[in-house]
């Protein structure tokens, strides 16, 4: 016969067992709580820091863009792409048609004050979008120039000049003294580029990357 | 509802489910142990009761004939 | 890690925890049920075994002396 366990020993064993089980339960719940807290607090901190970042980003832009128009990018609530309110958006850029008549250098400076550059046209689709907002009887500076007058055209943002993606009017460029490019309308060829003197005041088109907040 | 909000709602549901199930599991485990002890006492020693194997995360109920 | 990614990871952890605990709980419950039946058979009717009260979400192990 196995010696019988005393009732108090059994009670003690049960008590220890209960303690162990409830300890496990508490630890499990604590771990769950930690996880849950992390998922709630961290995102809030994340959101908070993101909001702070957003606000500072907005403050950065506020000096020259008092209001932004933002749209949600994709499904993610946090990714907003914004353009300054009077600007138009296309793909990942914002565009602004400046109706003030200024020289090429002044136009570029004017764009850069707004955090932009004179427009760099990379595709036919982009040009097609831009011309929708232009007036046929006006000319607009592009971010394209040949300061040396040696036909080494260069874009203001250092994008390589690709001869295959240019939209010059026929016979243009045609003058080594005309070192800045405009986009204008010719009834025979519709919209295209022309070289003109940089000091001649023209309207202009500014382009900037969308602001992601 | 946006995707992230949905995720947090699911988090809360799973969290509550986890807590409730943890409590139920622990309660059941203790009841099993208590029942085993009660069973031992009431059967006047005919059976040794439930044997506990601590190395397992769960408990197996096992009746053995005591050595005669 | 981004905010949503963190939420999805936590979802996965809670989901796995819920599944594991559900399985353990069910297993324990089945073992309790089996043990009750075994206990009843082995005691040659001395005890009625475990009585189940279906209205409860959990099961209470209870030995009752059969009516004499």
């Amino acid at each position: 016969m196995v010696p019988e366990e005393e009732p108090q020993d059994r009670e003690k064993g049960l008590w220890w067992f209960q303690l162990k089980v409830w300890s496990m339960a508490v630890v499990s719940i604590l771990l769950l709580s930690v996880c849950f807290t992390v998922s709630s607090v961290v995102p809030h901190n994340f959101m908070y820091s993101k909001t702070v970042k957003r606000l500072s980003k907005l403050r950065e832009y506020q000096q020259y863009h008092p209001s932004l128009t933002c749209v949600m990018e994709g499904k993610d609530i946090e990714d907003w792409s914004c353009c300054p309110t009077p600007w138009t958006s296309f793909q990942s850029s914002c565009y602004f048609i400046s109706t003030g008549m200024q020289s090429w250098t002044k136009s570029q400076k004017n764009c850069s004050v707004m955090g932009a550059d004179l427009v760099v046209i990379n595709t036919r689709e982009e040009q097609d979008f831009i011309i929708q907002n232009l007036k046929r009887n006006s000319s607009y500076f592009l971010g394209l120039s040949d300061p040396g007058g040696r036909r080494h055209w260069q874009w203001v943002d250092q994008t390589p000049y690709n001869e295959n993606v240019t939209f010059w009017h026929s016979g243009e460029p045609n003058n080594l003294d005309e070192r800045c490019a405009i986009i204008n309308f010719r009834s025979s060829e519709e919209w295209g580029w022309n070289d003109i003197h940089c000091h001649v005041p023209q309207k202009s088109i500014c382009k900037m990357k969308k602001i992601y907040i | 509802l946006g995707e992230p909000q949905l995720c947090y709602i699911l988090d809360a549901i799973l969290f509550l489910y986890g807590i409730v199930l943890t409590l139920l599991y622990c309660r059941l485990k203790i009841q099993v142990r208590k029942a085993a002890i009660t069973s031992y006492e009431k059967s006047d020693g005919v059976y040794t009761g439930l044997s506990t194997r601590n190395q397992e995360t769960y408990e197996t109920l096992k009746h053995e004939k005591p050595p005669q | 890690l981004g905010e949503p990614q963190l939420c999805y990871i936590l979802d996965a952890i809670l989901f796995l925890y819920g599944i594991v605990l559900t399985l353990l709980y069910c297993r324990l419950k089945i073992q309790v049920r089996k043990a009750a039946i075994t206990s009843y058979e082995k005691s040659d009717g001395v005890y009625t075994g475990l009585s189940t009260r279906n209205q409860e979400t959990y099961e209470t192990l209870k030995h009752e002396k059969p009516p004499q």
Partner: antibody, heavy 121, light 111 residues
Framework: EVQLVESGGGLVKPGGSLRLSCAAS????????MSWVRQAPGKGLEWVST????????YYPDSVKGRFTISRDNAKNSLYLQMNSLRAEDTAVYYC??????????????WGQGTTVTVSS | DIVLTQSPASLAVSPGQRATITCRAS??????????MHWYQQKPGQPPKLLIY???NLESGVPARFSGSGSETDFTLTINPVEAEDTANYFC?????????FGGGTKVEIK
């Protein structure tokens, strides 16, 4: 040798007209933008008008806009300035100057000797 | 219009000394590395003559004692050493944008 010779100046009554000419030689006239610059007695230099090499662009300051017209005849290597509705303040020595482009701007590398215009009653 | 302000209005220098003339623009006449200010010399009864273009480039045939410097809004013409034949009026000019404008001139006299 580059040479620019102005002519056509003289005395004219207020409201009158004059046509100044500038004969260019020693360079390919049709390849250069040209300007007229004036200097009132004892004063500084004041730009009056510009014409591009291909005749596609002309420009004037507000002080002469609508009254003065710049033109060129590349076949004759000549630059002209038609001045109408002349005023006393138009009295000055008028220089024709050749433009040289430098980066985004230009300067005047050669100047003629000038022709004097006097507007007086 | 861009206003160019020259100083001093007149300057008397001994031969062999340095003469410094400044020209201040009402706004920048530089673009990146291009400084679009030019300097002319005009002797009495003669047309202006180009000395310096692009702020610091010496026109061919101009003596090396003439030099130019500056960027954005502040530019300087230096004559060192001054010679008797340098008696003249000196003008700065910008044409980064139309209308091209000239400074009021600085009269340099040799003592």
């Amino acid at each position: 040798e580059v040479q620019l010779v102005e002519s056509g100046g003289g005395l004219v009554k207020p409201g009158g007209s004059l046509r100044l000419s500038c004969a260019a030689s020693g360079f390919t006239f049709s390849s250069y933008g040209m300007s007229w610059v004036r200097q009132a007695p004892g004063k500084g230099l004041e730009w009056v008008s510009t014409i591009s090499s291909g005749d596609s662009y002309t420009y004037y300051p507000d002080s002469v806009k609508g009254r003065f017209t710049i033109s060129r005849d590349n076949a004759k290597n000549s630059l002209y300035l038609q001045m109408n509705s002349l005023r006393a303040e138009d009295t000055a020595v008028y220089y024709c100057a050749r433009q040289i482009y430098y980066d985004y701007a230009y300067y005047f590398d050669f100047w003629g000797q000038g022709t004097t215009v006097t507007v007086s009653s | 219009d861009i206003v160019l302000t020259q100083s001093p209005a007149s300057l008397a220098v001994s031969p062999g000394q340095r003469a410094t003339i400044t020209c201040r623009a009402s706004e920048s006449v530089s673009f990146r590395t291009s400084h679009l200010m030019h300097w002319y010399q005009q002797k009495p009864g003669q047309p202006p003559k180009l000395l310096i273009y692009g702020a610091s480039n010496l026109e061919s045939g101009v003596p090396a004692r003439f030099s130019g410097s500056g960027s954005e809004t502040d530019f300087t013409l230096t004559i060192n050493p001054v010679e008797a034949e340098d008696t003249a009026n000196y003008f700065c000019q910008q044409s980064i944008e139309d209308p091209p404008t000239f400074g009021g001139g600085t009269k340099v006299e040799i003592k």
